[in-house]
């Protein structure tokens, strides 16, 4: 129970990609405002997004401090213009979020093919090491910096003239594949964390095809 003119937030949902992490909720406020708190299981509550009429709160700065921790958030509802007002139990109305462990749950962002180079019947495909929002020593760490050996990439490739796809995997950010001489190929990559139970795969990268600017062809 809360004050008669506030309603509790509901549908609290974490939206997170490459550790950019936003808590979303409903409803759109009518004559009320929200404040969000976030905590680790063992930590103190920290308030964010004070008295906002938004229904989202960017919690990236908090979760990147330790992406392997499990976080809980809660959204408080206050009457607009009377934020001191509390519910009948002496506390403002609030709702808890699901738990969220960024390292295990953040979505992997769409990767990008940085380059490809053909030398004879071999093609080297390089995946860009995407930047995350995890900062250490005033530097943003890359996806590989954060996940290390937990991160692999899958390459899908096919002849421009056919639809049959082949796949390759790498523990690094580079693939070396065999191709048929004189054929043009198209490529797409996907980031994967095989050890995860949820959000294991990114969306596929944009397709890049030989004979376009990004690649380089060398006849040997």
């Amino acid at each position: 129970s809360g004050t008669t003119n506030t309603v509790a937030a509901y549908n609290l949902t974490w939206k997170s990609t490459n550790f950019k992490t936003i808590l979303e909720w409903e409803p759109k406020p009518v004559n009320q405002v929200y404040t969000v708190q976030i905590s680790t299981k063992s930590g103190d509550w920290k308030s964010k997004c004070f008295y906002t009429t938004d229904t989202e709160c960017d919690l990236t700065d908090e979760i990147v401090k330790d992406v392997k921790q499990t976080y809980l958030a809660r959204v408080f509802s206050y009457p607009a213009g009377n934020v001191e007002s509390t519910g009948s139990a002496g506390e403002p109305l609030y709702e808890n979020s699901p738990e969220f462990t960024p390292y295990l749950e953040t979505n992997l962002g769409q990767p990008t093919i940085q380059s490809f180079e053909q030398v004879g019947t071999k093609v080297n495909v390089t995946v860009e090491d995407e930047r995350t929002l995890v900062r250490r020593n005033n530097t943003f760490l890359s996806l590989r910096d954060v996940f290390g050996k937990d991160l692999i990439y899958t390459l899908y490739y096919w002849k421009s003239s056919s639809s049959g796809k082949k796949t390759a995997k790498t523990n690094t950010n580079e693939f070396l594949i065999d191709v048929d001489k004189g054929e043009n190929y198209c490529f797409s990559v996907q980031a994967v964390i095989p050890s995860r139970t949820v959000n294991r795969k990114s969306t596929d990268s944009p397709v890049e095809c030989m004979g376009q600017e990004k690649g380089e062809f060398r006849e040997i």
Epitope: R136, N137, R144, G148, K149
Partner: nanobody
Framework: QVQLVESGGGLAQAGGSLRLSCAGS????????MGWFRQAPGKEREFVAA????????YYADSVKGRFTISRDNAKNTVYLQMNSVKPEDTAVYYC??????????????????????WGQGTQVTVSS
């Protein structure tokens, strides 16, 4: 799991130089960031330096910044620590470690960093005054 073997430790005069090497085998070496930690007698293990998987980013403890240089050669599966202008307080057992860069840097904040999954056996460095 990567197996790591350090070498290059020994006795040096204050102001002198040493070059430590760490050779890795096993899992793909070029996926890991590499770091050096050290432990002096009676003290906790402390972070010295780290280098990311590609060699493009390096990180140092304040106590060694400007004197030590970390580098790597992925073709040789080896990471190096060039120690110049050494001081008696650099005396310690130096350990090589392989992990994600995040784990190494967070280990540096939290002390020993012992949850990193691959450690060498260590090489002794002694600096005499």
């Amino acid at each position: 799991q990567v197996q790591l073997v350090e070498s290059g430790g020994g006795l040096a005069q204050a102001g002198g130089s040493l070059r430590l090497s760490c050779a890795g085998s096993g899992r793909t070496f070029s996926t890991d960031a590499m770091g050096w930690f050290r432990q002096a007698p009676g003290k906790e293990r402390e972070f010295v330096a780290a280098i990311n998987w590609s060699g493009g980013s390096t990180y140092y403890a304040d106590s060694v910044k400007g004197r030590f240089t970390i580098s790597r050669d992925n073709a040789k599966n080896t990471v190096y620590l060039q120690m110049n202008s050494v001081k008696p307080e650099d005396t310690a057992v130096y350990y090589c470690v392989a992990d994600s860069l995040l784990a190494l840097l967070d280990g540096s904040r939290g002390g020993p960093g012992t949850d990193s999954d691959s450690w060498g056996q260590g090489t002794q460095v002694t600096v005499s005054s």
